[in-house]
Interface confidence: low
């Protein structure tokens, strides 16, 4: 019966068994819902929107890492529909705390304005080095955690509020 089906299963009326929801491929996300016994008649998969990626399965597409705007790092590999962006070394005027434990944000670059004396990435950096690069103006730049929260709360890639 319905209640016995798992998170990614629907109840097949014909066989009387729980059946796996069709998983999406890389670069796709589910359209409508399937699981816990029910499946929308028009359930399917749609391509990831711009600036998002998915490894497939039942996951929604997630935003690429904002290397410059949030991590203050260079873009090593730009993301595509199937892969997240990879961040490279810190932007000019920023340095990495090498011994800092990784958290949900990964390794974040910090402003040379706050650096201890003789930090190698900051030697020769001017006080204005961090003033105006992508993502610092206004309040539009969100952390990966904030992006995830917006998606969970249903605002998605269209959200601007």
């Amino acid at each position: 019966e319905y209640s016995n089906c798992g998170e990614n299963e629907y109840y097949n009326q014909t066989t009387g068994l729980c059946q796996e929801c069709p998983p999406c491929g890389p670069g796709e996300e589910p359209y409508l819902s399937c699981g816990y016994g029910t499946k929308d008649e028009d359930y399917g998969c749609v391509p990831c929107p711009a600036e998002k990626f998915s490894k497939g399965g039942y996951q929604i597409c997630r935003r690429h890492k904002d290397c410059e705007g949030f991590f203050r790092a260079t873009v090593l590999t730009p993301g595509d529909m199937e892969n997240d962006a990879e961040c490279g070394p810190c932007l000019p005027g920023y340095y990495m705390l090498e011994n800092r434990p990784r958290n949900i944000y990964g390794m974040v670059c910090y402003s040379c304005l706050l650096a201890p004396p003789n930090t190698k990435e900051c030697v020769g950096a001017t006080s204005g080095a961090s003033a105006n690069f992508p993502g610092t103006s206004g309040s539009s730049t969100l952390s990966p955690f904030q992006h995830a929260h917006k998606e969970l709360s249903g605002q998605g890639h269209l959200a601007t509020a």
Partner: antibody
Framework: EVQLEKSGAELVKPGASVKISCKAS????????MNWMKQSHGKSLEWIGN????????NYNQKFKGKATLTVDKSSSTAYMQLNSLTSEDSAVYYC??????????????WGQGTLVTVSA | DIVMTQSPPSLSASLGDRVTISCSAS??????LNWYQQKADGTVELLIY???SLHSGVPSRFSGSGSGTDYSLTISNLEPEDIATYYC?????????FGGGTKLEIK
């Protein structure tokens, strides 16, 4: 079968408020955004905003901020839209429309029949 | 806001005809385009999503195509029940916006 049941037509006076409803059935109410659209007579459609019934979070079209307020009652699977300070410009047919997956709030998969609101002294 | 411009505003065609409705966006919308049908009684239905994907239960005579800023809806073999007004709608950016509509009539 997905169904969105509208409330009846409303005749209201200028300056007053009106609250129209959209009762959903045939699917998991909290799993999908509910959107609201305006269609003035002989005109195209305008998106007013949407609400995520699970969280109660909303998105509004800037044009309708302050004019429309979206709410839900999860226990009765009903979405509501209140329109304030009504003028003749607010006379229109208002539609509720269920979204696709929550992460695609610009999709309007199933539509209600539309509620006619007439503002007249 | 992204402005969606539909053409023609109205169209008269014969049963069995192939009909094409165009929709142009004021900026690129990356195929984030849907088409809706509104019947005379006000009933609205999703026909096509993501430029070219047919929504469940929609007859295969409906098809969509396009990219960038220019998109189109084609009805390959016009049936009496296709008499309606058709709207394109973008969901590339908030707020989602609709075209002005194309009213399709039978000759």
């Amino acid at each position: 079968e997905v169904q969105l049941e509208k409330s009846g037509a409303e005749l209201v006076k200028p300056g007053a408020s009106v609250k129209i409803s959209c009762k959903a059935s045939g699917y998991s109410f909290t799993g999908y955004n509910m959107n609201w659209m305006k269609q003035s007579h002989g005109k195209s459609l305008e998106w007013i905003g949407n609400i995520n019934p699970y969280y109660g979070s909303t998105n509004y079209n800037q044009k309708f901020k302050g004019k429309a307020t979206l709410t839900v009652d999860k226990s009765s699977s009903t979405a509501y839209m209140q329109l304030n300070s009504l003028t003749s410009e607010d006379s229109a047919v208002y539609y509720c429309a269920r979204g696709g997956v929550r992460e695609l709030p610009g999709w309007f998969t199933y539509w209600g029949q539309g509620t006619l609101v007439t503002v007249s002294a | 806001d992204i402005v969606m411009t539909q053409s023609p505003p109205s169209l008269s065609a014969s049963l069995g005809d192939r009909v094409t409705i165009s929709c142009s966006a004021s900026q690129g919308i990356s195929n984030y385009l849907n088409w809706y049908q509104q019947k005379a009684d006000g009933t609205v239905e999703l026909l096509i999503y993501s430029t070219s994907s047919l929504h469940s239960g929609v007859p295969s005579r409906f098809s969509g195509s396009g990219s960038g800023t220019d998109y189109s809806l084609t009805i390959s073999n016009l049936e009496p029940e296709d008499i309606a007004t058709y709207y394109c709608q973008q969901y590339s950016k908030l707020p989602p916006t609709f075209g002005g509509g194309t009213k399709l009539e039978i000759k």
